[in-house]
Interface confidence: medium
Amino acid sequence: SERCDDWGLDTMRQIQVFEDEPARIKCPLFEHFLKFNYSTAHSAGLTLIWYWTRQDRDLEEPINFRLPENRISKEKDVLWFRPTLLNDTGNYTCMLRNTTYCSKVAFPLEVVQKDSCFNSPMKLPVHKLYIEYGIQRITCPNVDGYFPSSVKPTITWYMGCYKIQNFNNVIPEGMNLSFLIALISNNGNYTCVVTYPENGRTFHLTRTLTVKVVGSPKNAVPPVIHSPNDHVVYEKEPGEELLIPCTVYFSFLMDSRNEVWWTIDGKKPDDITIDVTINESISHSRTEDETRTQILSIKKVTSEDLKRSYVCHARSAKGEVAKAAKVKQKVPAPRYTVELACGFGAT
């Protein structure tokens, strides 16, 4: 049997499309696996073949391209559904081959149903808007290539179930939806419905995305270390447990990596011999500002440990900060009998 480079089932590209709507799906080979495009492959005499495995079946079968009204068709490296049906769900394979070369990849396609308010099991893309930042826009996604530029579709925008018209700070502008000044109250799911004609038929494309209003870069500050601070002293006796929380506030910053770490006498805890554990927790505000807490714990602290320097460090795209914890050994209470004896002039 001839060898074929099989890239397996590409679950990273879990494609979801709505029932009874057009869908155009590009063969992932050219986008993610091969170093050449479809045109190059075609001119080199390679042929692109499509087949599929129905949901809950093991049998690979050819795709029927002879359905009424060309419901499923192929154009270059694109598989078209005009429109999809629920039972089109399955794993689809595109194979590029000639007599000496073969490469193929499979991907899952799920046809999902939506209700009248656009609720569905569809995984929604998230678009982040900065709070109170001036005019920002979202664009109706993934509608390129469905109709030629000569066709003027109608676009209707919804927030949740409600058609957007006469909203205070949200204005539909064709394919774009403009937010004059984004507020927390603008959080939610927004849907654009694009309606266009094709060969005497009318098609609808439904695209829903989640808008999340996040902290504005105008308000962003370097990390703020809330603890340790100058107002708290960790006074311990040898043998006691030492617990020091490092709590840091990070402003939301798009694509910023927030880091918190402890050093003990200038070294990372992993690089020293003390039996130290560090537990981290993270919480977020409504605008995705982040509070990270790392609790440094030494179960049975020694007098040596109490002389060490414990410093919490934090870093974001806005800068780096550090703060030392005030750790000291508890002075033992004076022994009563000795005090009494001294008080009475004993030698």
């Epitope: 708290v232 002293v233 006074e235 617990l243 020091i244 709590t247 506030y249 509070t291 807490t293 609790i295």
Partner: antibody
Framework: QVQLVQSGAEVKKPGASVKVSCKAS????????MNWVRQAPGQGLEWMGQ????????YYAQKFQGRVTMTRDTSTSTVYMELSSLRSEDTAVYYC????????????????WGQGTLVTVSS | DIQMTQSPSSLSASVGDRVTITCRAS??????????MHWYQQKPGKAPKLLIY???DLESGVPSRFSGSGSGTDFTLTISSLQPEDFATYYC??????????FGQGTKLEIK
Amino acid sequence: QVQLVQSGAEVKKPGASVKVSCKASGYIFITYWMNWVRQAPGQGLEWMGQIFPASGTTYYAQKFQGRVTMTRDTSTSTVYMELSSLRSEDTAVYYCARTDFYRYDGGYALDYWGQGTLVTVSS
Amino acid sequence: DIQMTQSPSSLSASVGDRVTITCRASQSVSTSGYSSMHWYQQKPGKAPKLLIYYASDLESGVPSRFSGSGSGTDFTLTISSLQPEDFATYYCHHSWGIPMYTFGQGTKLEIK
């Protein structure tokens, strides 16, 4: 969710002491300051002091210095407020309240409160 | 210690009214970028509830008819359109400088 549950009402004689507890749940207990605020009948709110559970560090309002002791038990996520040498004017509802930190280094608000404990001082 | 003067001490208003409560601190409770002034609502027999923190930030879950403003020494709590559930006592609270917190004496908002 964050909850602060306080101990029940107390009746005490003048000169006695009272110890009120506040059990915290739903957050990392040791990382937030806990405050005590009291309210005499028909009066306003009066801040008494605060404790940082991780270290046991305390700050007391001048008025209560020497009479109030705040402690914590990290194993049960509970803070305690003990007020000694009670007098009739200490009759009040005593609240524990968590201090949250928002984006700034200092100047924090009290974001969660216990349900309050009524302490009555009467001979 | 910073003293807080809240006014008025009581106020009668009707549902739908716009209401303003002010709080004056004896010294500034602001620094670059923020003010350590907070507002609470308290209903009879209940614990206070945080409404506004840092002078103007609305606490999560609090209706947007509540707003706060001011900096330095003078601060305002505004209720844009009074609702029946808003009749309560309101307190301002400063937390400037650790570790001394003080509250205003309260404003009792009653139905006219």
